[in-house]
Interface confidence: low
């Protein structure tokens, strides 16, 4: 998706709904694309992204991607439609209110990704094992 803060606003009298017809407004996410990061060996990190954007589409969720290779560490923050893969991975945890990082297999780098569906939830990315996504207290009940 393109950063929504550069888009023209659309004025109409309709609220977009999800597949079940539930009322949804576009979400707020940190949206700094790819930036260098100092986040390393921590239980959780803040994104240090100063741009909060209204996602382009109501169904989009917040995504954060943490990558480490021999040269640097980057953190990517975006909005993305969970029905579509991102970096070739499905957003399995899109319904979570917290951004719980999960490692993905990528050759030549360490690659973690998380997605979540509460406003600005990709501002705080969580690596700690104590945050287990099977814990119902961390799950936002969404019926897609």
């Amino acid at each position: 998706t393109i950063p929504p803060h550069v888009q023209k606003s659309v004025n109409n009298d309709m609220i977009v709904t999800d597949n079940n017809g539930a009322v949804k407004f576009p979400q707020l996410c940190k949206f700094c694309d790819v930036r260098f990061s100092t986040c390393d060996n921590q239980k959780s990190c803040m994104s240090n992204c100063s741009i909060t954007s209204i996602c382009e589409k109501p169904q989009e969720v917040c995504v954060a991607v943490w990558r480490k290779n021999d040269e640097n560490i980057t953190l990517e923050t975006v909005c993305h439609d969970p029905k579509l893969p991102y970096h070739d991975f499905i957003l399995e945890d899109a319904a979570s209110p917290k951004c719980i990082m999960k490692e993905k297999k990528k050759p030549g780098e360490t690659f973690f990704m998380c997605s979540c569906s509460s406003d600005e939830c990709n501002d705080n990315i969580i690596f700690s094992e104590e945050y287990n996504t099977s814990n119902p207290d961390l799950l936002l009940v969404i019926f897609q």
Partner: antibody
Framework: QVQLVESGGGLVQPGGSLRLSCAVS????????MSWVRQAPGKGLEWVSA????????HNTDSVKGRFSISRDNSKNTLYLQMNSLRAEDTAVYFC??????????????WGQGTLVTVSS | DIQMTQSPSSLSASVGDRVTITCRAS??????LNWYQQKPGKAPKLLIY???SLQSGVPSRFSGSGSGTDFTLTISSLQPEDFATYYC?????????FGQGTKVEIK
């Protein structure tokens, strides 16, 4: 603590206009969708209008379309409801509420204390 | 519009009683169902959202269940501060609609 304080209610003649305000404090107003919900005397609750966090999307219940307009000023942490062509059946306590928001949490919470609008000649 | 019907419209109960209020939607609303409590002259207060999720700060004696068209709010042991009117609300489709309310009175 979170506070929503409505003002602007009062007695108005049929066909008249009123502008309600809801001053918000205790949470980051610009991040959240907001709604107006009304309650006629001795009756139940009726959702009236909603506006997205940025203010670029609005939605009204059919009975007020073309007469009521919801807006917000994120720099002032204030929600508004402009009510024109008022009718006797618009008489109610009008509540502002945080909600009708993204992420599946489609509920109203918290609410203001309400402001009474009476339409009568 | 989706119609929400609560029953009973009022009930009398004593402190310590188990109280059950039902809400029926005119069509399936999945689990997009919220419950509110309102006391006279006050604003409504959210109790339960998404049919069964307890809102932060709400006592655990309140619980919600159901999906589709039939929903239940249960107060396991009625307390003096629970005497109020309770409303269900669907957020499955616009406009969001409320039930007519159930008034819980002291027996």
């Amino acid at each position: 603590q979170v506070q929503l304080v409505e003002s602007g209610g009062g007695l108005v003649q049929p066909g008249g206009s009123l502008r309600l305000s809801c001053a918000v404090s205790g949470f980051t107003f610009r991040r959240y969708a907001m709604s107006w919900v009304r309650q006629a005397p001795g009756k139940g609750l009726e959702w009236v209008s909603a506006i997205s966090a940025s203010g670029d999307r609005t939605h009204n219940t059919d009975s007020v379309k073309g007469r009521f307009s919801i807006s917000r000023d994120n720099s002032k942490n204030t929600l508004y409801l402009q009510m024109n062509s008022l009718r006797a059946e618009d008489t109610a306590v009008y509540f502002c509420a945080k909600g009708l928001a993204a992420s599946g949490k489609n509920f109203f919470d918290p609410w203001g204390q309400g402001t009474l609008v009476t339409v009568s000649s | 519009d989706i119609q929400m019907t609560q029953s009973p419209s009022s009930l009398s109960a004593s402190v310590g009683d188990r109280v059950t209020i039902t809400c029926r939607a005119s069509q399936s609303i999945s689990s997009y169902l919220n419950w509110y409590q309102q006391k006279p002259g006050k604003a409504p207060k959210l109790l339960i959202y998404a049919a069964s999720s307890l809102q932060s700060g709400v006592p655990s004696r309140f619980s919600g269940s159901g999906s589709g068209t039939d929903f239940t709010l249960t107060i396991s042991s009625l307390q003096p501060e629970d005497f109020a009117t309770y409303y269900c609300q669907q957020s499955y489709s616009t406009p969001p609609t409320f039930g007519q309310g159930t008034k819980v009175e002291i027996k």
